[in-house]
């Protein structure tokens, strides 16, 4: 079906939606992916929660946004921003970013277009 896109709504409403959801499970899920299940990640007690469980909780949280698809970019950017200072080196930043980019598909959403994940002003 052909469609012509109108306005997507305003980004401030996305920021409000992103603020309302708990992105911790997404952050934990990605950190587990890049650190490996067997390693302990200091910032969270993740030993008791399997990565697949975290992924499901993450997807559930993202689904809580009124317009998940439109606000996906802001959510991913917020996750990146939240974890930026915990990423120890350039390689870890790139790994985190790669996993973050795969997150929408893991949750059965479309990857956001035009989404710049380099949001930390060079910190990350």
């Amino acid at each position: 079906m052909r469609r012509e896109r109108g306005r997507q709504g305003d980004s401030s409403s996305c920021e409000r939606q992103v603020d309302r959801v708990n992105l911790k499970p997404c952050e934990q899920h990605i950190m587990q992916r890049i650190m490996g299940e067997q390693e302990q990640y200091d910032s969270y007690d993740i030993r008791s929660t399997r990565s697949s469980d975290q992924q499901q909780r993450c997807c559930d949280e993202l689904n809580e946004m009124e317009n998940t698809q439109r606000c996906m970019c802001e959510a991913l950017q917020q996750i990146m921003e939240n974890q930026c200072d915990r990423l120890q080196d350039r390689q870890m930043v790139q790994q985190f970013k790669r996993e973050l980019m795969n997150l929408p598909q893991q949750c059965n959403f479309r990857a956001p277009q035009r989404c710049d994940l380099d949001v930390s002003g060079g910190r990350c």
């Epitope: 305003d10 980004s11 920021e15 950017q77 980019m101 035009r114 989404c115 710049d116 994940l117």
Partner: antibody, heavy 123, light 110 residues
Amino acid sequence: EVQLVESGGGLVQPGGSLRLSCAASGFKFSTFYMTWIRQAPGKGLEWVANIKQDGSEKDYLDSVRGRFTISRDNAKSSLYLQMNSLRAEDTAVYYCTRNGLQDSYSGDFFDHWGQGTLVTVSS
Amino acid sequence: QSVLTQPPSVSAAPGQKVTISCSGTGSNIGHNYVSWYQQLPGTAPKLLIYDNTKRPSGIPDRFSGSKSGTSATLGITGLQTGDEADYYCATWDADLSAVLFGGGTKLTVL
């Protein structure tokens, strides 16, 4: 070598119509977003419209939405801009551009431009 | 009035460095990628930088791009007289569902 050649510009009265065409060659047309960009005499660049690879999504500048229609024919490697209800402020050189936007995590960028075709709306 | 703000003009001597700023908001530069274009007098624009920092093949490394928050910057080092042109930034605006161009900056090499 990538080439974009626009045609169809000219002088038209306010309220009139024109159809711009862009013949593309030197690349696989069906795999790229395409974009029309215009430049009024002595002014800056202004984006007009985007069309997705398969034509399923189109975006327009607010001031042309409902008056202009972007379309493409991938079999002919051609891009079109149907312009209706033309106004004096639509007077500009219209550029056909190839847009490097991919499906995710990339931005719009215009890596190849035609030479432009001048549209003059005047009575 | 463009939503992306650029200085109308900048100037510097040959061999010097110049930067051109492009200021926007969270709904455009803040969330999306920036590209830069050079338009020599009487010609079509040419892509200089895309996805904030990347250079297309054939663009010398004298040209660089960066982005921080809601602003982007084009840097040109080793200025040459042939760099005299108009320079434009561009990005997508999620609120408008449209590509925005800056108003353009005229570079004069003194």
